[in-house]
Amino acid sequence: KLTIESTPFNVAEGKEVLLLAHNLPQNRIGYSWYKGERVDGNSLIVGYVIGTQQATPGPAYSGRETIYPNASLLIQNVTQNDTGFYTLQVIKSDLVNEEATGQFHVYPELPKPSISSNNSNPVEDKDAVAFTCEPEVQNTTYLWWVNGQSLPVSPRLQLSNGNMTLTLLSVKRNDAGSYECEIQNPASANRSDPVTLNVLYGPDVPTISPIISPPDSSYLSGANLNLSCHSASNPSPQYSWRINGIPQQHTQVLFIAKITPNNNGTYACFVSNLATGRNNSIVKSITVSASGTSPGLSAGAHHHHHH
């Protein structure tokens, strides 16, 4: 039985579609393609005589159609008006013609979407972020990608407005990364350029290393004191030290050569992040013994944080 196959069935505007004829009869002498579901002279697109290989345009011919010897019809630069049914009439030598109808659907060419954001530098546990995928296109599916992966399932992620809007409630540092939106219809898809979400966080409670074990041991007089402070923060925190409450340098590492019992006391590392408006600190007690006990930091480490 004569059949028509559309390749592709769903066509993006501006692309081309090929209507393929299958199971053509042996005794064929010509073909006629019509726009619509029936044979109607006013809807004739093109006729073709096999013997002369001559194609004759009809009233529905637009200049974008090409008929081939195998009866296939190529339509280029399709528009949405081309959506619908197409009928092939095969003229046979016995004059008992065969007909078959096929169809395709033209979808609008999708624009490249873009993402707008109400806040690309949110503060952890404080701000919400809404990403909107634009423009709004009817009969289109909206998808979101985070760092190249589909959206994770999370109660803090909300899709709304037909999935055009992605809202991150109370952002976390792990939400940082690259966000893309994609719009799809049955014929095509288009993805936005990535937007980077930079989550501001911290500074977390700092740690001072080396962590000396056992914790109740003290430094030997004459040893070098080398304390390194670290706190997770974005942007990197500003570090500063105080010894017995007296401000010292603004470095991550505090180094004192050849300590003596005069260096006994509390050593505090302060970290601050202007972007989050948060500060934190940790205090360690250092004991320097005049003679032979094992080196270390004392037990009384405690920390403070401020918002």
């Epitope: 942007p235 990197s236 500003q238 570090y239 991550q252 590492v253 202007l274 972007a275």
Partner: antibody, heavy 120, light 107 residues
Framework: QVQLVQSGAEVKKPGASVKVSCKAS????????LHWVRQAPGQGLEWIGY????????SYAQKFQGRVTMTRDTSTSTVYMELSSLRSEDTAVYYC?????????????WGQGTLVTVSS | DIQMTQSPSSLSASVGDRVTITCRAS??????LAWYQQKPGKVPKLLIY???NLVEGVPSRFSGSGSGTDFTLTISSLQPEDVATYYC?????????FGQGTKVEIK
């Protein structure tokens, strides 16, 4: 007291290279990043890049990528800035400057500057 | 890169006047902003960091304020020794960028 002492003035021909040194003293050399900033005659300040003396890690302004190289010698507490393929618009006073602390701090101590003149 | 725009490019004021210089960043700097003073023929000197913190030894007539993208350096009572060019600079990550400078003169 903290001091940054730079090498003397240089006159170079277009296409040549210049290497300026900056010797640090009065503080722990490896604890503070050192930056290079230049100032063309009658113009403003332009950041070139920095080096972490502890690790040797460098970061350069895009404009100078491929032309600038910063190195350090921890044994002499000295950093170096080499600029190649010199052109007349590189004529400037080049300053080394210490970052006030680690991470997101400005520049608190500056060298006296080295005038580099590029002329044919 | 972040752009720093200073205004005015120059100003002339009388001794004792209150002088204000503004600096606008192209992106939010969260307060990571410094001010420098450069006297003629001299090396730049850090006055203020973190937009309002006065460096030790800097006279209290200098003060900084602002937030986000807009910052101000104020000299409450201009002195003859304040004749200089003043530069703002963001210090939130690299590349560091400076404003084009404001030249302050005495009338």
């Amino acid at each position: 007291q903290v001091q940054l002492v730079q090498s003397g003035a240089e006159v170079k021909k277009p296409g040549a290279s210049v290497k300026v040194s900056c010797k640090a003293s009065g503080y722990i050399f490896t604890s503070y990043y050192l930056h290079w900033v230049r100032q063309a005659p009658g113009q403003g300040l332009e950041w070139i890049g920095y080096i972490n003396p502890q690790t040797g890690y460098t970061s350069y302004a895009q404009k100078f990528q491929g032309r600038v190289t910063m190195t350090r010698d921890t044994s002499t507490s000295t950093v170096y800035m080499e600029l190649s393929s010199l052109r007349s618009e590189d004529t400037a006073v080049y300053y080394c400057a210490r970052e006030y602390g680690n991470y997101n701090y400005p520049l608190d101590y500056w060298g006296q500057g080295t005038l580099v003149t590029v002329s044919s | 890169d972040i752009q720093m725009t200073q205004s005015p490019s120059s100003l002339s004021a009388s001794v004792g006047d209150r002088v204000t210089i503004t600096c606008r960043a192209s992106e939010n700097q969260y307060g990571y902003l410094a001010w420098y003073q450069q006297k003629p023929g001299k090396v730049p000197k850090l006055l203020i960091y973190n937009y309002k913190n006065l460096v030790e030894g800097v006279p209290s007539r200098f003060s900084g304020s602002g937030s986000g993208t807009d910052f101000t350096l104020t000299i409450s009572s201009l002195q003859p020794e304040d004749v200089a060019t003043y530069y703002c600079q963001h210090h939130l990550g690299t590349p560091y960028t400076f404003g084009q400078g404001t030249k302050v003169e005495i009338k």
